[in-house]
Interface confidence: low
């Protein structure tokens, strides 16, 4: 037996941790630990966390729970999911918005804001994607009007002058 | 290999106040729990404080508690103890000693060698 | 806090044997203890822990020398093949919880003389 580098926990069950100096039994997820065993292998006492806040995953350390986090208005930001015992509030953007991340690098943690998606249909184009960030990312022109410079034109209806060519079926020669 | 070393003790008068330090090196210093123990003139060993790996957990021994305050800097491997209000009784060596870093049964499994403080007027 | 209880001293012949004892508070006759060597004018040192089933660890470069054994509320430290350098004071200590608090109690220590 020489030359063990450190005694590890030898209590049954996978789930116990040193805390302080006893091997314990940990505290579930959404319960923050109160007070340590105070005997080898005994069971921490653990209390569910408050109102508000939450902790995600099995612990022996926490003393505290952390504090839910709150959907920032001033970003547009809405909660998609309400924080509980065992999970933080999961921040988003209603419906129509898109993320806009504050952050060149993103990831799910990135600060971010909301902004609303383009309207293609006012901009009288096809909606291609299910929310467009950009004109380009809208389709083409809806029936009636025609790609001029930058944007959708209506077409004329009447039959005198030019009769661009997506819009024969407005103003074309009627056979 | 494992390196304990202790500093800050020396002479000191009843209600001043020292600050010893415990530097580390040859283990992942912010893995491990971390003590102080002292040992009186040919007395034996007293436990004086301890901190867990993170700072979290912090405790005392009665006769300290309230003016001595254990803390550590995990970025420069080191422990502290800073010792206010001494009296004569807190003349001893000062040990910092390590806990294991595993989970599981406890011991203090490497020692300083230690540093005296006198508290005499 | 729990108590540990050790005899004063203690001695043992060159290449001879003796065993130490450290008796726990009956209440904590379960519970594991370490013992400690201290040399004179030296840290301490850890050179085992010791449960309650006698089954124990010891430390980096213990010899084999030493071990341990337990007894109800006994916890023995043997060593066998005494050499000079095993002139030293013994500590057994053990950890508590205690109303939250975290906390190490030492015994007396006994003193090995080496004849």
């Known amino acids: 037996q020489g030359g063990t580098r450190s005694p590890r926990c030898d209590c049954a069950g996978d789930f116990h941790k040193k805390i302080g100096l006893f091997c314990c039994r940990g505290c579930p997820a959404g319960h923050y630990l109160k007070a340590p065993c105070t005997e080898p292998c005994g069971n921490s006492t653990c209390l569910v966390c408050p109102q508000d806040t939450f902790l995600a995953w099995e612990n022996h350390h926490n003393s505290e729970c952390a504090r839910c986090q709150a959907c920032d208005e001033q970003a547009s930001q809405v909660a998609l999911e309400n924080c509980s015992a065992v999970a933080d509030t999961r921040c988003g953007c209603k419906p129509g918005w898109f993320v806009e991340c504050q952050v060149s690098q993103c990831v799910s943690s990135s600060p971010f804001y909301c902004q609303p998606c383009l309207d293609c249909g006012a901009l009288h184009r096809h909606t291609r994607l299910l929310c467009s960030r950009r004109d380009t990312d809208c389709g083409t022109c809806l029936p009636g009007f025609y790609e001029h410079g930058d944007g959708c034109v209506s077409c004329p209806t009447s039959t005198l002058g030019s009769c661009p060519e997506r819009c024969a079926a407005v103003c074309g020669w009627r056979q | 290999e494992v390196q304990l070393v202790e500093s800050g003790g020396g002479l000191s008068q009843p209600g001043n106040s020292l600050q010893l330090s415990c530097e580390a090196s040859?283990?992942?210093?912010?893995?491990?729990?971390l003590n102080w123990v002292r040992q009186a003139p040919g007395k034996g060993l007293e436990w004086v404080a301890y901190i867990s790996s993170a700072s979290g957990l912090i405790s005392y021994a009665d006769a300290v508690r309230g003016r001595f305050t254990i803390s550590r800097d995990n970025a420069k491997n080191s422990l502290f103890l800073q010792m206010n209000n001494l009296k004569s009784e807190d003349t001893a060596m000062y040990y910092c000693a390590r806990d294991p870093a595993y989970t599981g049964l406890y011991a203090l499994d490497f020692w300083g060698q230690g540093t005296q403080v006198t508290v005499s007027s | 806090q729990p108590v540990l209880t050790q005899s004063p001293s203690a001695s043992a012949s060159l290449s001879g044997s003796v065993k130490l004892t450290c008796t726990l508070s009956s209440e904590l006759s379960n519970y594991t203890i370490v013992w400690y060597q201290q040399r004179p004018d030296k840290a301490p040192k850890y050179v085992m822990y010791l449960k309650s089933d006698g089954s124990h660890s010891k430390g980096d470069g213990i010899p084999d020398r030493f071990s341990g054994s337990s007894s109800g509320a006994h916890r023995y430290l043997s060593i066998s093949n005494v050499q000079s350098e095993d002139d030293a004071t013994y500590f057994c200590?053990?950890?508590?919880?205690?109303?939250?608090?975290?906390?190490?109690?030492f015994g007396s220590g006994t003193k090995v003389t080496v004849l």
């Open positions: 040859g283990f992942t210093f912010s893995n491990h729990d």
């Open positions: 200590g053990m950890g508590y919880t205690l109303a939250n608090q975290y906390g190490w109690v």
